[in-house]
Amino acid sequence: SLAADTPTACCFSYTSRQIPQNFIADYFETSSQCSKPGVIFLTKRSRQVCADPSEEWVQKYVSDLELSA
């Protein structure tokens, strides 16, 4: 089965509250072509949430995903 093409995602605003870490499944950084930098978290219910890459909790979650077992 084939996936349809997906446009590049950009963040125009960031979540105003910290997402519980156990809600997070994966992440990606937005393209340099976007007007704002962003980290998009993919939640365990398959929703996408924009977060500010300069925030400490965002950096921690990204690091933990990269270093997980």
Partner: nanobody, 114 residues
Framework: EVQLVESGGGLVQPGGSLRLSCAAS???????MGWYRQAPGNEREFVAR???????NYEDSVKGRFTISQDNAKNTVYLQMDSLKPEDTASYVC?????????WGQGTQVTVSS
């Protein structure tokens, strides 16, 4: 830009095993791949993921029973599912993250029943 082809689903008895595959094709670098599942009437839920560097994460309900692995050269991810239970019955949907987006497959059906 990215196409995902899933295979390996089917009907299996409780306690049995299946191995799902998801092959990604396209011209972009894949950062991570993984699986969600969706049973009829339920929300899509996370199963497992693996990063290009080999980092893995699992949903608690599948830890110790499911194993995710990858072949980076083939841009393919595998989900080995052992000790299957009736509650594992669902459509298993592969995803890949790359090129600043999440790309989804169409899903492969897994039915666990005696």
């Amino acid at each position: 830009e990215v196409q995902l082809v899933e295979s390996g689903g089917g009907l299996v008895q409780p306690g049995g095993s299946l191995r799902l595959s998801c092959a990604a094709s396209g011209s972009i670098f894949i950062n991570s791949m993984g699986w969600y599942r969706q049973a009829p009437g339920n929300e899509r839920e996370f199963v497992a993921r693996i990063s290009s560097g080999g980092s893995t994460n699992y949903e608690d309900s599948v830890k110790g029973r499911f194993t995710i692995s990858q072949d980076n050269a083939k841009n393919t991810v595998y989900l080995q599912m052992d000790s299957l239970k009736p509650e594992d019955t669902a459509s298993y949907v592969c995803y890949a993250i790359g090129g600043g987006a999440v790309h989804w497959g169409q899903g492969t059906q897994v039915t666990v029943s005696s």
